[in-house]
C-alpha cells in the first residue's frame, strides 16, 4: 500500500493510473467504501462523503489514463485509506495528514518558551525534528519545547515530520519580541544633551501597549519612575513624566528619550519596560548613563565620572599632545599644580576612548576656562 503524507491546510494529489491510455470509468472511495468521486462518461460525479466539497480530479488527464484524486484544504481527519477502482483493479493509497502549530501565538517575548505541537492521525507514530534559524536542532514526538527564547530564534523554523520512511516539511515563522539590545550605555560630558534610543528587534502591523522607565541614580538610595507612556498603533503618547529631570519623548518608533542635560545626579542605570497588548510579560532594556566632569579648583585639576563603569575602564588626565600625567582604574583622578595648556580627561577601554572632556588651564594669575 502506497503511503502519502500531507500537511493540514494544503492540497494533496493521489495518483491512479490505468494501463489503457484513455478515459475509462473510475471511482475513488474511502475506507468505508463510500464514493468520493468518479466519472460518468466525461462528467465528474461526486459521492456524499465528507470530502464532497474539497475533492476534485483533473479531467484533462483522464484521456491519458490518469485519474487523480485531489483533496483541498486537508484536515487531520482526512487521514484514511483511499481506494481507486479502475479496470477491475484496486489501487490503495494511505494518506496521513499532519499539522504543526505553535503554542497560542507565533509572536513570543524574549525569554518565553516556544512549544510546537504536532497534530497527527490516530495510529501514527511520527518523529519530529526542528531546526531553528540559528541552526539549533531539537527533536521530539507530539510536542517540542524550547525554553528561554533568544532574539536569534526569530525567523523561520523548519520542522521535518518522519513517518513510514517518508517526510513532510513544515515552516513556521516565529517572531521573538525584544529590544535590539538588552543593554546599552551612554557616555556624556556634564551639561550635554542625552539621547536614549530603544529600537525594537521586530516589526508588526499594529503595536499597542504601555511602558515605563525606572531610574536608579548612583547617588540615590532608591529608584524612581522617570516617565510612563502609551503606545497605540506605533504612536507614542506620554502619560506622566517627572519634573526633575524633565524627559522628552519622541512620538514615533523607535522609542526615543531626550534628557536635556547630563548631570552627575542623573548618572546611573535605568530599566525601560514595555508591556504589549495581549501578551503576558514585558520587554526590558537596560540603559546606563555615565557622566564626566572636569574641574579646576585653585591648584587642583580634577576629572570625575559618575555612573556604572566597569572596573577595567581607565580614567586619565593628560596635557594635549603629551603623555598621561595620571591614569587610574578609578572614578576620579586629579593633578596638583597643573601646567598651563589644554588638558584632556579621557575615559577609555583598552585604549579606545569612550568619553573625553577638555579643560584649559591658564597661567597661575588667570582663572581656568572650560571650552
Amino acid at each position: 500500500k502506497k503511503v502519502v503524507l500531507g500537511k493540514k491546510g494544503d492540497t494533496v494529489e493521489l495518483t491512479c493510473t490505468a494501463s489503457q491510455k484513455k478515459s475509462i470509468q473510475f471511482h475513488w472511495k474511502n475506507s468505508n467504501q463510500i464514493k468520493i468521486l468518479g466519472n460518468q462518461g466525461s462528467f465528474l460525479t461526486k459521492g456524499p462523503s465528507k470530502l464532497n466539497d474539497r475533492a476534485d480530479s483533473r479531467r484533462s488527464l483522464w484521456d491519458q489514463g490518469n485519474f487523480p484524486l485531489i483533496i483541498k484544504n486537508l484536515k487531520i481527519e482526512d487521514s484514511d485509506t483511499y481506494i481507486c477502482e479502475v479496470e477491475d483493479q484496486k489501487e490503495e493509497v494511505q494518506l496521513l495528514v499532519f499539522g504543526l502549530t505553535a503554542n497560542s501565538d507565533t509572536h513570543l517575548l524574549q525569554g518565553q518558551s516556544l512549544t510546537l505541537t504536532l497534530e497527527s492521525p490516530p495510529g501514527s507514530s511520527p518523529s519530529v525534528q526542528c531546526r531553528s534559524p540559528r541552526g539549533k536542532n531539537i527533536q521530539g514526538g507530539k510536542t517540542l519545547s524550547v525554553s528561554q527564547l533568544e532574539l536569534q530564534d526569530s525567523g523561520t523554523w523548519t520542522c521535518t515530520v518522519l513517518q513510514n520512511q517518508k517526510k513532510v516539511e513544515f515552516k513556521i515563522d516565529i517572531v521573538v519580541l525584544a529590544f535590539q539590545k538588552a543593554s546599552s550605555i551612554v557616555y556624556k560630558k556634564e551639561g550635554e544633551q542625552v539621547e536614549f534610543s530603544f529600537p525594537l528587534a521586530f516589526t508588526v502591523e499594529k503595536l499597542t501597549g504601555s511602558g515605563e522607565l525606572w531610574w536608579q541614580a548612583e547617588r540615590a538610595s532608591s529608584s524612581k519612575s522617570w516617565i510612563t507612556f502609551d503606545l497605540k498603533n506605533k504612536e507614542v503618547s506620554v502619560k506622566r513624566v517627572t519634573q526633575d529631570p524633565k524627559l522628552q519623548m519622541g512620538k514615533k518608533l523607535p522609542l526615543h528619550l531626550t534628557l536635556p542635560q547630563a548631570l552627575p545626579q542623573y548618572a546611573g542605570s535605568g530599566n525601560l519596560t514595555l508591556a504589549l497588548e495581549a501578551k503576558t510579560g514585558k520587554l526590558h532594556q537596560e540603559v546606563n548613563l555615565v557622566v564626566m566632569r572636569a574641574t579646576q579648583l585653585q591648584k587642583n585639576l580634577t576629572c570625575e565620572v559618575w555612573g556604572p563603569t566597569s572596573p577595567k575602564l581607565m580614567l586619565s588626565l593628560k596635557l594635549e599632545n603629551k603623555e598621561a600625567k595620571v591614569s587610574k582604574r578609578e572614578k576620579a583622578v586629579w593633578v596638583l599644580n597643573p601646567e598651563a595648556g589644554m588638558w584632556q580627561c579621557l575615559l577609555s577601554d583598552s585604549g579606545q576612548v569612550l568619553l573625553e572632556s577638555n579643560i584649559k588651564v591658564l597661567p597661575t594669575w588667570s582663572t581656568p576656562v572650560q571650552p
Epitope: 468505508n32 467504501q33 463510500i34 461526486k46 459521492g47 456524499p48 462523503s49 465528507k50
Partner: antibody, heavy 120, light 107 residues
Framework: QVQLQESGPGLVKPSETLSLTCTVS????????WSWIRQPAGKGLEWIGR???????TYNPSLKSRVTMSVDTSKNQFSLKLSSVTAADTAVYYC??????????????WGQGTTVTVSS | DIQMTQSPSSLSASVGDRVTITCQAS??????LNWYQQKPGKAPKLLIY???ILETGVPSRFSGSGSGTDFTFTISSLQPEDIATYYC?????????FGGGTKVEIK
C-alpha cells in the same frame, strides 16, 4: 441518544422566507453533516441540502437559488431559510443527521417533522 | 441529478404474501442504495443499505438485491405491522435522491 427537534412558524405567506431551526439534544453537533428533507402531503421525500459544523454546505440544485443553511454550534442548532416561497413549498419539513459508516451513507436520526403551509 | 423510479406506487397484499418493490436508477449507482420504511405521521426508518445489507434489528423477512440501475426490495411474508410507505434512496452522488415511494396496504 441523539434527538432532533424542528421549530419554526407553521404558516408562511407567499413570496416570504420560510425559516426553520433544528435543535440537537443528547449529543454533539460536531463531526456530522446535518440535512433538511421535505415531504409534500401524500408525496415523496426531497433532500434539500446539508451543512456541517464548519459551515460547509451542499444544496439540491433544484432549490439552490432559494436555500441558505447555517449552523450555531454554541446552541447545538442548525437552520434552514427558503426564500420566495410558493404553495409548492407546502410540506412536512424534517431535519436529520447524515451518517457514514462501512458501505452506508444516509439519514440515521430524524426529527418528528414540522408542517409548513404557504398561504396568504 | 440521479432520478429514482419506484414501482408500483401502491400495492395491496394479504398477510403472509410475498411483496416485491422495484427501484430503477437513471444511471449506474453501483450498490449505493438504501431502503426506508415510513409509517403514517412518522419519520422514515432505515431497513436496508448498500442494496442488500440488513440494518441491525430489522426482521429478516425484509431483503434487498440488485446493483447498477435495477434494484428489488422484498418482504417474504407480509405482516400487519408492515403497513407503510417504502422508499429507495441512492447515495452514489449528491444530491441524495429518493424514489417516489410505494404504499403497501393489507387486503
Amino acid at each position: 441518544q441523539v434527538q432532533l427537534q424542528e421549530s419554526g412558524p407553521g404558516l408562511v405567506k407567499p413570496s416570504e422566507t420560510l425559516s426553520l431551526t433544528c435543535t440537537v439534544s443528547g449529543g454533539s453537533i460536531s463531526t456530522y453533516y446535518w440535512s433538511w428533507i421535505r415531504q409534500p402531503a401524500g408525496k415523496g421525500l426531497e433532500w434539500i441540502g446539508r451543512i456541517n459544523t464548519s459551515g460547509s454546505t451542499t444544496y439540491n440544485p433544484s432549490l439552490k437559488s432559494r436555500v441558505t443553511m447555517s449552523v450555531d454550534t454554541s446552541k447545538n442548532q442548525f437552520s434552514l431559510k427558503l426564500s420566495s416561497v410558493t404553495a409548492a413549498d407546502t410540506a412536512v419539513y424534517y431535519c436529520a443527521r447524515e451518517l457514514e459508516r462501512y458501505y452506508y451513507y444516509g439519514m440515521d436520526v430524524w426529527g418528528q417533522g414540522t408542517t409548513v403551509t404557504v398561504s396568504s | 441529478d440521479i432520478q429514482m423510479t419506484q414501482s408500483p406506487s401502491s400495492l395491496s397484499a394479504s398477510v403472509g404474501d410475498r411483496v416485491t418493490i422495484t427501484c430503477q436508477a437513471s444511471q449506474d449507482i453501483s450498490n449505493y442504495l438504501n431502503w426506508y420504511q415510513q409509517k403514517p405521521g412518522k419519520a422514515p426508518k432505515l431497513l436496508i443499505y448498500y442494496a442488500s445489507i440488513l440494518e441491525t434489528g430489522v426482521p429478516s423477512r425484509f431483503s434487498g438485491s440488485g446493483s447498477g440501475t435495477d434494484f428489488t426490495f422484498t418482504i417474504s411474508s407480509l405482516q400487519p405491522e408492515d403497513i407503510a410507505t417504502y422508499y429507495c434512496q441512492q447515495y452514489d452522488s449528491l444530491p441524495l435522491t429518493f424514489g417516489g415511494g410505494t404504499k403497501v396496504e393489507i387486503k
